[in-house]
């Protein structure tokens, strides 16, 4: 019985290969701190396998625990620039549905020009992740300096 | 039919367990910014399961999407040292085959003595990853301060 | 034969879904540099699936290679504070059993207020991971600023 049960759980598509790696498309208008992302092979090395983009924000399609990671580098930045414009802060969170709104990951730049981090977090189908950059400095659009991704880890 | 198909996809070796975690062996000669890595249980907690080392650079053996991560700490470093020697930059990229050469991940130290980041990226069998450290400071060889690794995530 | 062999390897619980994401509970008494962690759905987005907490330290239940990640943010911190209180250092290591004691991951704050990193490392059933924060600054208990987790990757 247990043997047969295992089989039903394990066709390839049920293994939860959901994964996405995005590159920065653009920043929002003045009062919108969100970063807008894009992904797909035509753009280079970014991709979406499972999750989708909804107006530049990442929407989850499969319930589970995900590894969320991000790196953001500020454009034309030195440690002097970064400290002068402090606080510049990046926050990754669930922004919709509103009932599940929460900050998942938050970092300040202080005297650095790059932040990078990652964490495990439960996400549900329909959760939309937003990345808010507050401050007066622009993020770099270089694909090796600024990126955002998720990886499904387990149910 | 689907049931039988799943079985053919799922023997252990086909699950793509390819993974490697490397420690710094040495830096290159003067005009070579590459870091040279080593791995294996005899060296401590580093290992290669799938990928191989080719003259200190990591070569991929299985196509797929990989999580690439790195941490580099500068030796005998303070925030004063780091800012004085700016720009000290680390870049991780595909360096061969030449047709696939690209920078995957780039960070500057600014006033810090450690950089750490990670990203998802598609890699193909035969891709060789190089880690270039530009600047006039030495990377620490302590295994808990400087390391580089990859983990196969999905086809 | 290979077909049957695959089945034996792949019941769900044998896939090694062990994973944990913890939030800071409290710091230790004066001479104890360890951070004490907590996890569970009642606390928010932290969880333990496989590993356990032993007096606030994370104990591993399954042998394998793990991705270990951490982010620690210092409370009420500016780059001036951080540099003034240097060295403030975070180390993640195996603290028991004593025979396996080793530092796995080490970072200093220098002029920053957050450190974040990750690495792959072999861990064995019974290994207890400790996170030591040395210095005179308190870590933030905000769940989006300070967290610690592990993810089983392969046998």
């Amino acid at each position: 019985q247990r043997f047969a049960q295992a089989q039903q759980q394990l066709p390839l598509e049920s293994l939860g290969w959901d994964v996405a790696e995005l590159q920065l498309n653009h920043t929002g208008p003045q009062q919108d701190p969100r970063l807008y992302w894009q992904g797909g092979p035509a753009l280079g090395r970014s991709f979406l396998h499972g999750p989708e983009l909804d107006k530049g924000q990442l929407r989850i399609h499969r319930d589970g625990i995900y590894m969320v990671h991000i790196q953001v580098t500020l454009a034309i930045c030195s440690s002097t620039t970064a400290s002068r414009h402090h606080p510049t802060t990046l926050a990754v969170g669930i922004c919709s549905p509103a009932s599940r709104s929460i900050s998942l990951l938050r970092l300040s730049f202080h005297q650095g020009c790059t932040i990078a981090s990652q964490r495990l977090t439960p996400l549900a189908r329909g959760d939309t992740l937003c990345t808010n950059l507050t401050g007066t400095l622009l993020p770099s659009r270089n694909t090796d300096e600024t990126f955002f991704g998720v990886q499904w880890v387990r149910p | 039919q689907r049931f039988a198909q799943a079985q053919q996809q799922l023997p252990l070796e086909s699950l793509g367990w390819d993974v490697a975690e490397l420690q710094l062996n040495h830096t290159g000669p003067q005009q070579d910014p590459r870091l040279y890595w080593q791995g294996g249980p005899a060296l401590g907690r580093s290992f290669l399961h799938g990928p191989e080392l080719d003259k200190g650079q990591l070569r991929i053996h299985r196509d797929g999407i990989y999580m690439v991560h790195i941490q580099v700490t500068l030796a005998i470093c303070s925030s004063t040292t780091a800012s004085r020697h700016h720009p000290t930059t680390l870049a991780v990229g595909i360096c061969s085959p030449a047709s696939r050469s690209i920078s995957l991940l780039r960070l500057s130290f600014h006033q810090g003595c450690t950089i750490a980041s990670q990203r998802l990226t598609p890699l193909a069998r035969g891709d060789t990853l190089c880690t270039n450290l530009t600047g006039t400071l030495l990377p620490s060889r302590n295994t808990d301060e400087t390391f580089f690794g990859v983990q196969w995530v999905r086809p | 034969q290979r077909f049957a062999q695959a089945q034996q390897q792949l019941p769900l619980e044998s896939l090694g879904w062990d994973v944990a994401e913890l939030q800071l509970n409290h710091t230790g008494p004066q001479q104890d540099p360890r951070l004490y962690w907590q996890g569970g759905p009642a606390l928010g987005r932290s969880f333990l699936h496989g590993p356990e907490l032993d007096k606030g330290q994370l104990r591993i239940h399954r042998d394998g290679i793990y991705m270990v990640h951490i982010q620690v943010t210092l409370a009420i911190c500016s780059s001036t504070t951080a540099s003034r209180h240097h060295p403030t250092t975070l180390a993640v290591g195996i603290c028991s059993p004593a025979s396996r004691s080793i530092s796995l991951l080490r970072l200093s704050f220098h002029q920053g207020c957050t450190i974040a990193s990750q690495r792959l490392t072999p861990l064995a059933r019974g290994d207890t991971l400790c996170t030591n924060l040395t210095g005179t600054l308190l870590p933030s208990r905000n769940t989006d600023e300070t967290f610690f987790g592990v993810q089983w990757v392969r046998p």
Epitope: - | L24, I76, R84, T136, L137 | -
Partner: antibody
Framework: EVQLVQSGAEVKKPGSSVKVSCKAS????????MHWLKQAPGQGLEWMGA????????SYNQNFKGRVTLTADKSTSTAYMELSSLRSEDTAVYYC?????????????WGQGTLVTVSS | DIVMTQSPDSLAVSLGERATINCRAS??????????MHWYQQKPGQPPKLLIY???NLESGVPDRFSGSGSGTDFTLTISSLQAEDVAVYYC?????????FGQGTKLEIK
């Protein structure tokens, strides 16, 4: 190949000051600390201090008790060492030196040395 | 300050023979997986010349009869087969912290 060329020998009175120059060839001058070392006749080597020409930051050996001042002129790729309140025991050969690739305090390139004689 | 002590103060070795000079630091000069110990050769009227850096790395252009070893506090410079042009004073130096300091020197002569 970097070359460091120092100014010529000096004879000074006790209590006076001396300023020794060190001109570097090549375009890497601002990126490497320039160190100054003292070698008294028949004696060993003593590190005096260093300057990072990129921003003028200095570090000094406490043994010289504030008598040494290091400066640098990026426009001419020249470093200077001034030693004040001279006394007879300051009679020595003074060297400028720097590393070739990594900017740590070991010394690949050396000036030819400048003999400073302090005598009344 | 870290005190560097060389031994012997002077050494006479026959041509073609091995010469060994030792250097002891008053505390460890190892950090970050490196030993910040270096060796120089100085001939009369010349500035010192770097032979070995980071304990065991041969500086470019230095003959491979020179080698360095050691870690922590104890280090050795070895000349495997002494040549006439190797007559000089040899200094060890650390750069683990400021100020960097030198040994008192070892005078190497031909026996």
């Amino acid at each position: 190949e970097v070359q460091l060329v120092q100014s010529g020998a000096e004879v000074k009175k006790p209590g006076s000051s001396v300023k020794v120059s060190c001109k570097a060839s090549g375009d890497t001058f601002p990126r490497y600390n320039m160190h100054w070392l003292k070698q008294a006749p028949g004696q060993g080597l003593e590190w005096m201090g260093a300057i990072f020409p990129g921003n003028g930051e200095t570090s000094y050996n406490q043994n010289f008790k504030g008598r040494v001042t290091l400066t640098a002129d990026k426009s001419t790729s020249t470093a200077y060492m001034e030693l004040s309140s001279l006394r007879s025991e300051d009679t020595a050969v003074y060297y400028c030196a720097r590393n070739s690739y990594y900017d740590y305090a070991w010394f690949t390139y050396w000036g030819q040395g400048t003999l400073v004689t302090v005598s009344s | 300050d870290i005190v560097m002590t060389q031994s012997p103060d002077s050494l006479a070795v026959s041509l073609g023979e091995r010469a060994t000079i030792n250097c002891r630091a008053s505390k460890s000069v190892s950090s970050s997986g490196y030993s910040f110990m270096h060796w120089y050769q100085q001939k009369p009227g010349q500035p010192p010349k770097l032979l070995i850096y980071l304990a065991s790395n041969l500086e470019s252009g230095v003959p491979d009869r020179f080698s360095g070893s050691g870690s922590g506090t104890d280090f050795t410079l070895t000349i495997s087969s002494l040549q006439a042009e190797d007559v000089a004073v040899y200094y060890c130096q650390h750069s683990r912290e400021f100020p960097p300091t030198f040994g008192q020197g070892t005078k190497l002569e031909i026996k």
